[in-house]
Amino acid sequence: ECMTKLFQDTYFHGGDIAVVFTPSAKHCQVVCTHHPRCLLFTFMAESEDPTKWFTCTLKDSVTETLPMLNMAGAISGYSFKQCSHQISACNTNVYVDLDMKGVNYNSSVSKSAQECQERCTNDMHCHFFTYATRHFPSVKHRNVCLLKYTQTGIPTSIKKLTDVVSGFSLKSCALSNLACIRDIFPTTVFADSNIDSVMAPDAFVCRSICTHHPNCLFFTFFSQEWPTESERNLCLLKTSNSGLPSTRIRKNKAFSGFSLQNCRHSIPVFCHSSFYHDTEFLGEELDIVGENGHEACQKTCTNTIRCQFFTYSPSQESCNGGKGKCYLKLSSNGSPTKILHGRGSISGYTLRLCKMDNACTTKIKPRIVGGTKSVLGEWPWQITVHITSPTQRHLCGGSIIGNQWILTAAHCFNEVESPRILRVYSGILNQSEIKEDTFFFGVQEVIIHDQFEAAETGYDIALLKLETTINYTDSQRPICLPSKGDRNVMYTDCWVTGWGYTKLRDKIQNTLQKAKIPLVTNEECQAGYRSHKITNKMICAGYKEGGKDACKGDSGGPLSCKHNEVWHLVGITSWGEGCAQRERPGVYTRVVEYVDWILEKTQEA
């Protein structure tokens, strides 16, 4: 069962698997969650023994719990592995008066801690940083930004130090501007130094492992047809000083590619849902259970907290009701210790790690081609914002971007004096479904960009913080924010959705409408709007001849673009001249330009 509570002045006795340093108990809990075996942890805050400060002891237990003992300054808790909510490694906190130690590999002057953190985020080797503020006692060290890395991505120690701040790279928040290379190159071996090697069933799993590894920048995978038997299914994790492979060698049956650390939110990286036929995963055996088929075996593994992967052996005889043997397994690093083929078994991984991926990457219902009306579950991030005063009506669209957050347009709230009169309905296809007793989310807070004045001048973006959290289902789930590393992506499959007017003088539609609309360059768009400035924080979409566009009532809703099988919230419906007019494209808020703002506001709230 999910236990998010932290226990103060308590430590778990025994079960130690590793001791690391973290700046807070919360961060310790995240480290535990991402560790392949950690189920519980004890964090030492400032106690009597300074050598124990900031230690995070990761623990495992066959019974999933350990004896709790009293200890001043200790904070204990459980990993989020047992929880169904989404888990992110993203940590935007900066820690004042803490020096997080690692290998300093770059030292330079920075204007602020924020600039230092950006430098770290955009440096491929950087895990965390320490910045000496302008009040630091040693004059020459003031405003110095130290970029650091370690073998584990976690500090080797943490010390109290006045007038410094430390923090982590925001790569895992999808905030890096570094290039994101998604190609996997066949018949290619990267010849650079190996930092680690693991067993993997295919190049995609190898890439995921590389992405998850703190120092892996690229990888080479030898398939099961690789001539050297001892190297088959071997996944070599690699790095280099430049961050790029120095040598590529052409070799058959080998595949190479890059870590997705700079585009982590754009495709699933932790979750391996495939089944590997005629394949046996070796590892430490946790349990053997009888199951009807490999899907049931995977489900059992997913529901068994310590299970990391499984092998299913179909039944050879019918006497046990056709049930095969489901071997639940684990290892020290979460990967099989060896992979064998040709024994008729089916293997795979736990799906427990799927929640470590952004929920927005989950595959959704296939698009209905043709027609303008949507079907339920086609745009599960689309919500309708209602205003209840003086009478209840649809006000604007919006998009689910987190389990308590809606992204919408600022201009929707020009006349709204209080969040109390707002209601958010999700999982809705037809406005007529909304009755007096229909479930809605109250709005706790409306956060409007502080530079917003009018839609036409930009910054037309707002966040709604909901009073309760959304449980994701097929009909209500988030859309991915674009990754800053994907700034130059040319989106070709973009759709605008909403319940807005279908022509300028019209009324709100009952069924959610959709229209496929091409993106237009800002130069082209500017030509149609002589009296307005189309800024780089805006993006335009529309047909030259007009005819399809967003219109009144669609405001705040998404301009959704599909890229690499994942939907991204590229724009927020903002303004335009009329609706669907010739050479007057719709103007949208360019979401990628506000990713930092969104993160800042959602984290601080």
């Epitope: 300093n104 030292s107 330079s108 000496a132 040693s138 004059v139 060290h141 130090l161």
Partner: antibody
Amino acid sequence: QVQLEESGPGLVAPSQSLSITCTVSGFSLTGYGIYWVRQPPGKGLEWLGMIWGDGRTDYNSALKSRLSISKDNSKSQVFLKMNSLQTDDTARYYCARDYYGSKDYWGQGTTLTVSS
Amino acid sequence: DIVMTQSHKFMSTSVGDRVSITCKASQDVSTAVAWYQQKPGQSPKLLIYLTSYRNTGVPDRFTGSGSGTDFTFTISSVQAEDLAVYYCQQHYKTPYSFGGGTKLERL
């Protein structure tokens, strides 16, 4: 682990130049400053100068005109050059790593004797 | 340039004693003072930095205090292995400078 090792000529004639190399391992010179400190026989420590991670340098005011510190990041080496040596430059020369102005790791030192 | 003065060149002590070494800066150095221990034939070893922060692995009998121009280094209970020369150093402003050193010897 962190190590610093000085290597120098040992004996130099007066008015000649000195070149000492500090070779480091276990850390990167782009991320840390390196100091040079000397200690004449039976005397105290004297700060000579330093080179920062980003290549900036600072020198002891009294020796500035005779000193030059440089480095080669790729070879993990820092160089101390000093000209117009006199007998009172006889000392043990240490390199040390910077930790916010203090020196957390020191080499074993190399002894220089200035004598004809 | 900043001059650091350790008024006592020698201090006598016995095992178990509490001893304090003082260091004075010629101008305000905030809290940017470090203390080093040097034993015969060895390199100096960092004990305290930024006035009061103990370096990793340094026993807690060694402490530092002060700010501005006056600084004190204290050994709460002297051990035989603590007999050595102790130097203060300002790391407030370059050129950094050391005090002349205080030799702690057996009474």
